[in-house]
């Protein structure tokens, strides 16, 4: 008794296709090709066995809820167009939907609307007020802010990770020690090595030190100040210790010394 | 041309129940919906129960809402009435009809009724 789908319809029934967020209310229209003087207009839900469940109704001049308060019929001024809404929509409201009518005598008609099929999509954004639904989320800005704020935390600590790195590789760059020695006249470790400059360190004895001196840890460079220590004639060789008293008579350097660097 | 045929009538007692069943012959591929009235001895024929045959949309009079079921089956052609808690008031020549197109009414084509009778 399968008929084949019909080409017109007194009902119609749209939009064919709905999609709604969870807690949003979902419309359909209910449309009568012209209005009778007695009908019965039901809205229905398919069941998974193909079953129809009546949801409300209209009948003379009244509305007949259903078992569900949130299933809602309104007629609208033109008298030939129903409102059904579903209020606050649930995921399990997803489904099969049509309207029907039946034309009482004395010429009793029955009509069916196409079917139409509501999709009900979880909440993404912030829940509704008028309904219970999950833990609030946060919104999109709010989550733009958030994102942006610890993209920015990320970098800091990228680059501060940066910083120490190259100060570990690179320790004599970080404690700001000059390359002395003439550039004309590198000198190399083989034929293949490249240009390396040599400085030799006089080594200071603070005398009011109580303890030898530690080897200096690496730190970061607004932490460290640098004086320019001269020392005269030509520099001290590797190993020459230099009392602080020695520094006190420093003079200014001859061009032939570079200056150095070194952190107090 | 659609042929009708009632079958399940009989005589109950008031609170008891019945089946009636209608099945559908002939061109049955152009019905669009079927339906149940009734007449009792010196009224007119009343509405009881339509199905629309595609959607399985229901409807019912009121008299007999909640106590009264309608339902089809495609693959056997037939369409039901599942009758409880009857009274007396429910006797009557049962009448299956069949709507033959959207445009059509619940009343294109007529069974010969079954009659149903409730008495204590």
């Known amino acids: 008794l399968d008929s084949p789908d019909r080409p017109w319809s007194p009902l119609t029934f749209s939009p064919a296709q709905l999609t709604v967020q969870e807690g949003e209310n979902a419309t359909f229209t209910c449309s009568l090709a012209d209005i009778p003087d007695s009908f019965v207009l039901n809205w229905y839900r398919l069941s998974p066995r193909n079953q129809t469940d009546k949801l409300a109704a209209f009948q003379e001049d009244r509305i007949e809820p259903g078992r569900d308060r949130r299933f809602r019929v309104t007629r609208l001024p033109n008298g030939r167009d129903f409102h059904m809404s579903i209020v606050a929509a649930r995921l399990n409201d997803s489904g099969i939907y049509l309207c029907g009518a039946i034309y009482l005598p004395p010429n009793t008609q029955i009509n069916e609307s196409p079917r139409a099929e509501l999709s009900v999509t979880e909440r993404t954004l912030e829940p509704p007020t008028q309904s219970p639904s999950p833990p609030p989320r946060l919104s999109g800005q709010l989550q733009g802010l958030v994102i942006g704020v610890t993209s920015v935390l990320v970098g800091v600590l990228l680059l501060l990770l940066l910083t120490w790195v190259l100060a570990a590789v690179f320790p004599r760059a970080t404690r700001g020690a000059c390359v002395c020695g003439s550039e004309d006249e590198p000198l190399k470790e083989g034929p293949d090595a490249a240009p390396v400059f040599t400085l030799d360190y006089g080594e200071l004895d603070f005398q009011w030190r109580e303890k030898t001196p530690e080897p200096p840890a690496p730190c970061a460079p607004e932490q460290t100040e640098y004086a320019t220590i001269v020392f005269p004639g030509r520099p001290a060789s590797p190993g020459r210790r230099a009392s602080a008293s020695s520094l006190q008579g420093a003079q200014p350097p001859s061009p032939e010394d570079g200056p150095g660097l070194w952190p107090l | 041309e659609v042929q009708l045929v009632e079958s399940g009538g009989g005589e109950v007692k008031p609170g008891g129940s019945l089946r009636l069943s209608c099945v559908a012959s002939?061109?049955?591929?152009?019905?669009?919906?079927m339906g149940w009235f009734r007449q009792a001895p010196g009224k007119e024929r009343e509405f009881v129960a339509g199905?629309?045959?595609?959607?399985?949309?229901?409807y019912y009079a009121d008299a007999v809402k909640g106590r009264f079921t309608i339902s089809r089956d495609h693959a056997k052609n037939t369409v039901y009435l599942q009758m409880s808690s009857l009274r007396a008031e429910d006797t009557a020549v049962y009448y299956c009809?069949?709507?033959?197109?959207?445009?059509?009414?619940?009343?294109?084509?007529w069974g010969q009724g079954t009659q149903v009778t409730v008495k204590p």
């Open positions: 009809a069949a709507q033959e197109s959207a445009a059509g009414t619940l009343g294109d084509y």
């Open positions: 002939g061109r049955t591929v152009s019905i669009y919906a």
């Open positions: 199905i629309g045959w595609n959607g399985g949309t229901t």
